[in-house]
């Protein structure tokens, strides 16, 4: 159908709750596109009625809420006037229990966000909340350890928690939980987020951290177009390289005629404390000699690698 | 649609205190935080603090943190602002202020002003 | 508390031509969740403030589209693509990244 393939890392998710992911990728869609979601490679797009508990809106898919059975591969086709892209996005749901007395015990949140905190800092948690204007949110409420936060070293802030005066005690396990409209029926949303304290002002050293990749497998097809990022994070005054590896070359170097494979341009986002650096790899066309080779993103003295993997063949 | 009305026009001897209104109607009226803000005469806008209506919790910038009080009336949807100790400089307008909505922040609604001047 | 900056004081702009405010805070306010908590206002002479632009670059409700917001963490600019008579006002930018919020002092657009 000549779209082509781009292979976005998988989204895990919790039972019976709205989500939403928003299909777009700023080189393609900052154009005149249509966009047109479908699931599991069927021919028949994701509807468009808004009453439909699984509907597109606008370039948007809306899970309300979201079931134990939609897990799965779903794909967003982009089409521009002389471009087709498709985007495979692999949902995992989960059952989630909280702080169901039934159950016993706090809920185990290290699957979910991980936020941090600087002691002895005024900082703030973020609840992280990606629905389309259809969709009206609040209040939002935070929890502590299965309690309501209250105090003067508290305030909630739109989707944020300020924390005046961060101490050790306020490591732990919160959930953000807000309220979301849409069509006149209510859902509740809830976002655990696992808290940890640094006393280091940003981030210390000068070692970098690779965020992504995490020395993985990423199942593609033969003869798609991939893109990768290798996020890292790092000081603001570091001095060190960020770059893609392959058999300890350059991945420019090693595809030095054909091109195929390549390093995109570096680009990073300044925060208070620390940069954000974005690098990736773009593998034009997949091919077999591309699997089980493992690609890597260096950073400074970090490393973390990609290994491309077949898909297993479906049989059903 | 969102409505803030506000208390008339207040004239005050140095010293004394003025308490200004703020009426809300046409949302949830303790889902919001309320911000006052003033405006000294041909001056910029300052931030006084905040008022969580449902818990009445006030956030205050600092400045202001010995005279002022916050309290609302949730059966008429009203807060409240008393500022006490007033001397010449806190001539100004008093604006309060609701968010966009609950999850962006900026004020997009506001009320439309009360004129307080101390003057002996 | 985080000072916002503001230039220039006042600017003078023929109706039709491109208009540029810009605002500069004292400390970062992209937040590590990808937002950057920085506003724009219009004070219209005798009335209160209007939300022009919020997080940094959306379009308030009802806001035309000749305004336009950027920036980086720390410098911000709005941008009036035409000028019209209505848009005359002193132009404030804020910041509500943390506790006390504050504003810039302002800058007066008038209309050659």
């Known amino acids: 159908d000549g779209c082509k393939d781009i292979f976005m890392k998988n989204e895990i998710l919790s039972a019976s709750q709205p989500f939403a992911f928003n299909c777009t990728f700023p080189p393609i869609t900052s154009g005149e596109v249509s966009v047109t979601w479908y699931k599991n490679s069927s021919k028949i797009p994701v509807s468009k009625i808004i009453q439909s508990r699984i509907h597109q809106d606008e370039t948007w898919i809306l899970f309300l809420p979201m079931e134990w059975g939609d897990s799965g591969v779903y794909q967003c086709v982009i089409k521009g006037r002389d471009s087709c892209h498709r985007i495979h996005v692999n949902l995992t749901v989960f059952e989630k229990h909280w702080c169901d007395t039934s159950i016993g015990g706090l809920p185990n949140l290290s699957d979910e966000y991980k936020q941090i905190l600087h002691l002895g800092k005024d900082d703030s948690l973020t609840c992280h909340l990606h629905f389309p204007k259809s969709c009206v949110l609040g209040p939002i409420k935070w929890y502590k350890d299965c309690n309501e936060i209250k105090g003067e070293r508290f305030t909630v802030l739109e989707t944020r928690l300020l924390v005046s005066n961060v101490s050790a005690e306020d490591r732990g396990n919160y959930a953000c939980q807000a309220i979301l409209t849409h069509s006149g029926k209510q859902y509740e949303v809830l976002n655990g987020i696992t808290v940890s304290i640094t006393e280091r002002a940003g981030y210390g050293g000068s070692v970098p951290k690779i965020i992504y990749p995490k020395n993985h497998s990423i199942e593609v097809q033969l003869g798609t177009t991939l893109i990768v990022d290798c996020n890292v994070t790092d000081t603001k005054d570091n001095t060190n390289l960020r770059c893609w590896r392959v058999n300890n070359t350059l991945v420019d170097d090693y595809y030095d005629e054909s091109k195929r494979i390549r390093e995109g341009v570096e680009t990073h986002v300044s925060f208070r404390e620390h940069n954000l650096y974005t690098v990736n790899i773009t593998f034009l066309e997949v091919k077999m000699e591309d699997y089980g080779l493992p690609f890597m993103c260096h950073a400074g003295v970090s490393t973390a690698y990609i290994i491309l993997q077949l898909p297993a063949p479906d049989f059903r | 649609q969102v409505q803030l009305v506000q208390s008339g026009a207040e004239v005050k001897k140095p010293g004394a205190s003025v308490k200004v209104s703020c009426k809300a109607s046409?949302?949830?009226?303790?889902?919001?935080?309320m911000n006052w803000v003033r405006q000294a005469p041909r001056q910029g806008l300052e931030w006084m603090g905040m008022?969580?209506?449902?818990?009445?919790?006030?956030r205050l910038n600092q400045k202001f943190k010995d005279r002022v009080t916050m309290t609302r009336d949730t059966s008429t949807s009203t807060v409240y602002m008393e500022l006490s100790s007033l001397r010449s400089e806190d001539t100004a307008v008093y604006y309060c202020?609701?968010?966009?909505?609950?999850?962006?922040?900026?004020?997009?609604?506001w009320g439309q002003g009360t004129l307080v001047t101390v003057s002996s | 508390d985080i000072v916002m900056t503001q230039t220039p004081l006042s600017l003078s702009v023929t109706p039709g031509q491109p208009a540029s405010i810009s605002c500069r805070s004292s400390?970062?306010?992209?937040?590590?969740?990808?937002?950057?908590?920085f506003y724009w206002y219009l004070q219209k002479p005798g009335q209160p403030p209007q939300l022009l632009i919020y997080?940094?670059?959306n379009l308030a409700s009802g806001v035309p589209d000749r305004f336009s917001g950027s920036g980086s963490g720390t410098d911000f600019t709005l941008k009036i693509s035409r000028v019209e008579a209505e848009d005359v006002g002193v132009y404030y930018c804020?910041?509500?990244?943390?506790?006390?919020?504050?504003f810039g002092g302002g800058t007066k657009v008038e209309i050659k």
């Open positions: 046409g949302y949830t009226f303790t889902n919001y935080w």
């Open positions: 008022f969580e209506p449902s818990n009445a919790v006030t």
């Open positions: 997080q940094m670059s």
């Open positions: 202020a609701r968010t966009t909505s609950m999850i962006i922040g900026g004020f997009a609604y």
């Open positions: 400390k970062s306010l992209l937040h590590s969740n990808a937002i950057t908590y």
């Open positions: 804020a910041q509500n990244l943390e506790l006390p919020l504050t």
